[in-house]
């Protein structure tokens, strides 16, 4: 309930906010949950706490884990959890689902794409913007404050947009990138029974105990703007929100429009520090619209350890 997912790339700055809010004068203590070790507040540290914010300058893959923040108010302490995952940089241009922020939709009249999480950082204009990893050039694109405006939006403007900016902390500069999908609303659309693209029904995914894993639930619902189109994960038939395990978190549903114009939605279930008991759960990807509900089930299995026995006698 009081947990939030945050993610970033290694060697970039990542700033995380405590999910519990309070007055600016309240003291906030941060801990690394697994060791209960206090996070220092001295800025000379690579990872340090600054009030409601936890700063990784820069982040490393080993920083991944659950962090506890305690907001100390006069009458009681409020505890929150920040579930942080730091990923290695992708060698190719493709940005995986688990690094994507929520999708925005645009039309000819309104085509603002906000740079996600930028308000947490100390940055100065201008922002750099990329579409499918290509730097945006031309008079149609205007970087304004923390958002991008596209003039005369067309359907082929849909795609993945990445903003890149520099965070400054005490004179040192750190790069930050964030990516989100942009879809273009199609006036002429239709709706149909949901088709789940992933996972396949009764699929089994191999995982390693102690590692992090992500499950993507992706479904298509027709073409153009949809009145109702939702995807979600369930655990053993229960909503994620009813399942009080901060290691397992579902992102908000994310719209995606593919080249064929289909309106598709996906959501990622993030499981941190996979445990034996996670293998016993049934993971249901649910896709729902006005036409009905479709369900695909996936289970987790333990990855067989590599046989390290010698091949010599």
């Amino acid at each position: 309930k009081f947990s939030k997912q945050s993610w970033g790339l290694e060697n970039e700055a990542l700033i995380v906010r405590c999910p519990r809010q309070g007055k600016s004068s309240y003291i906030v203590d941060w801990y690394y949950s697994q060791t209960n070790k206090s996070i220092p507040t001295q800025e000379r540290n690579r990872v340090f706490a600054s009030g409601q914010l936890l700063k990784f300058l820069p982040a490393e893959v080993a920083d991944s884990g659950i962090y506890t923040c305690i907001v100390r108010s006069p009458t009681f302490n409020r505890t929150g959890y920040a579930n942080v995952t730091i990923y290695k940089k992708q060698p190719d241009c493709n940005v995986p689902d688990y690094l994507m922020y929520s999708t925005v939709s645009g039309s000819e009249k309104n085509s603002k794409i906000y740079c996600p999480t930028i308000d947490l950082y100390n940055w100065t204009a201008p922002l750099e913007w990329f579409k499918n990893c290509q730097a945006l050039q031309g008079s149609r694109y205007k970087a304004h404050k923390s958002f991008l405006v596209i003039d005369n939006v067309m359907t082929d403007d849909a795609g993945d947009y990445t903003c890149k900016f520099i965070h400054n902390e005490n004179g040192a500069n750190y790069s930050v990138t964030a990516t989100r999908s942009f879809t273009v609303k199609d006036e002429q659309g239709f709706s149909r029974f949901p088709v789940i693209r992933a996972p396949a029904h009764n699929e089994t995914k191999e995982v390693e105990i102690g590692e992090n894993t992500n499950l993507t639930c992706s479904a298509c619902f027709g073409k153009g703007a949809q009145f109702l189109a939702t995807v979600q994960w369930q655990l053993n038939g229960n909503k994620i929100t009813d399942f009080s395990e901060p290691r397992i978190q579902q992102e908000e549903g994310q719209n995606q429009s593919f080249s064929n114009g289909l309106a598709c939605v996906n959501t990622v279930l993030r499981i941190a520090d996979v445990k034996e008991e996670d293998l016993l759960l049934r993971y249901d990807c649910l896709a729902l619209n006005l036409h009905g509900l479709r369900r695909h089930t996936i289970r987790l299995s333990r990855k067989n350890p590599i046989d390290h026995q010698s091949t010599y006698c």
């Epitope: 999910p19 809010q21 309070g22 007055k23 004068s25 003291i27 006069p74 308000d119």
Partner: antibody, heavy 116, light 113 residues
Framework: QIQLAQSGPELKKPGETVKISCKAS????????MNWVKQAPGKDLKWMGW????????TYGDNFKGRFAFSLETSASTVYLQINNLKNEDTATYFC?????????WGQGTLVTVSA | DIVMTQSPPSLSVSVGEKVTMSCKSS????????????LAWYQQKPGQPPKLLIY???TRESGVPDRFTGSGSGTDFTLTISSVQAEDLAVYYC?????????FGGGTKLEIK
């Protein structure tokens, strides 16, 4: 500049439901909680509770549990107050106020009149 | 709940006079964790939302004239207007900003002679 813009006045009958909105602008919405304060005509101020705008968690004052619901639409930087099964004593001006050391920013208020 | 008691309920003063009003809380509003007193003062004019004047018992909100001063600690607090102006006609509320439920005093109505 920071602004909290509330929806317009409402005239309702007892037993009906009202939902009023408070749209924030000029700051990062999810950085600050939002409080709701009630002021009946000619009376003093009553704190109703607040909502955590980052995770959507509401906290209600003792006299405002049950018929009252706080909600939010993060993408629109908007919080909502819904009052169900309206009673005559719900007639009041309702203010949203941004959390902080003291409430430095207030909406203009929404007058809800409950009358048969 | 913390009860906030304001006195007097109303005051009538002339322009230029000094005025003080009192606010007492039923429990201490001092937080030992940071030595802050969580008390706020507001001014409310007819048909308007309250305006924050003072927070932390004595810190003046940005843009508030320096004729407004807050003082006190623990359970006893005072708002002083050093030289009342015509535009100060309003109701003044103190607020427990310390713990839930945040409670307001009954107000002091300032009238100009």
């Amino acid at each position: 500049q920071i602004q909290l813009a509330q929806s317009g006045p409402e005239l309702k009958k007892p037993g009906e439901t009202v939902k009023i909105s408070c749209k924030a602008s000029g700051y990062t919405f999810i950085n600050y909680g939002m409080n709701w304060v009630k002021q009946a005509p000619g009376k003093d101020l009553k704190w109703m509770g607040w909502i955590n705008t980052y995770i959507g968690e509401p906290t209600y004052g003792d006299n405002f549990k049950g018929r009252f619901a706080f909600s939010l639409e993060t993408s629109a930087s908007t919080v909502y107050l819904q009052i169900n099964n309206l009673k005559n004593e719900d007639t009041a001006t309702y203010f949203c106020a941004r959390e902080g050391d003291g409430f430095a920013y207030w909406g203009q208020g929404t007058l809800v009149t409950v009358s048969a | 709940d913390i009860v906030m008691t304001q006195s007097p309920p109303s005051l009538s003063v002339s322009v230029g006079e000094k005025v003080t009003m009192s606010c007492k809380s039923s429990q201490s509003l001092l937080y030992s964790g940071n030595q802050n007193n969580y008390l706020a003062w507001y001014q409310q004019k007819p048909g308007q939302p309250p305006k924050l004047l003072i927070y932390g018992a004595s810190t003046r909100e940005s843009g508030v004239p320096d004729r407004f001063t807050g003082s006190g600690s623990g359970t006893d607090f005072t708002l002083t207007i050093s030289s009342v102006q015509a535009e100060d006609l309003a109701v003044y509320y103190c607020q427990n900003d310390h713990s839930y439920p945040y409670t307001f005093g009954g107000g002091t109505k300032l009238e100009i002679k």
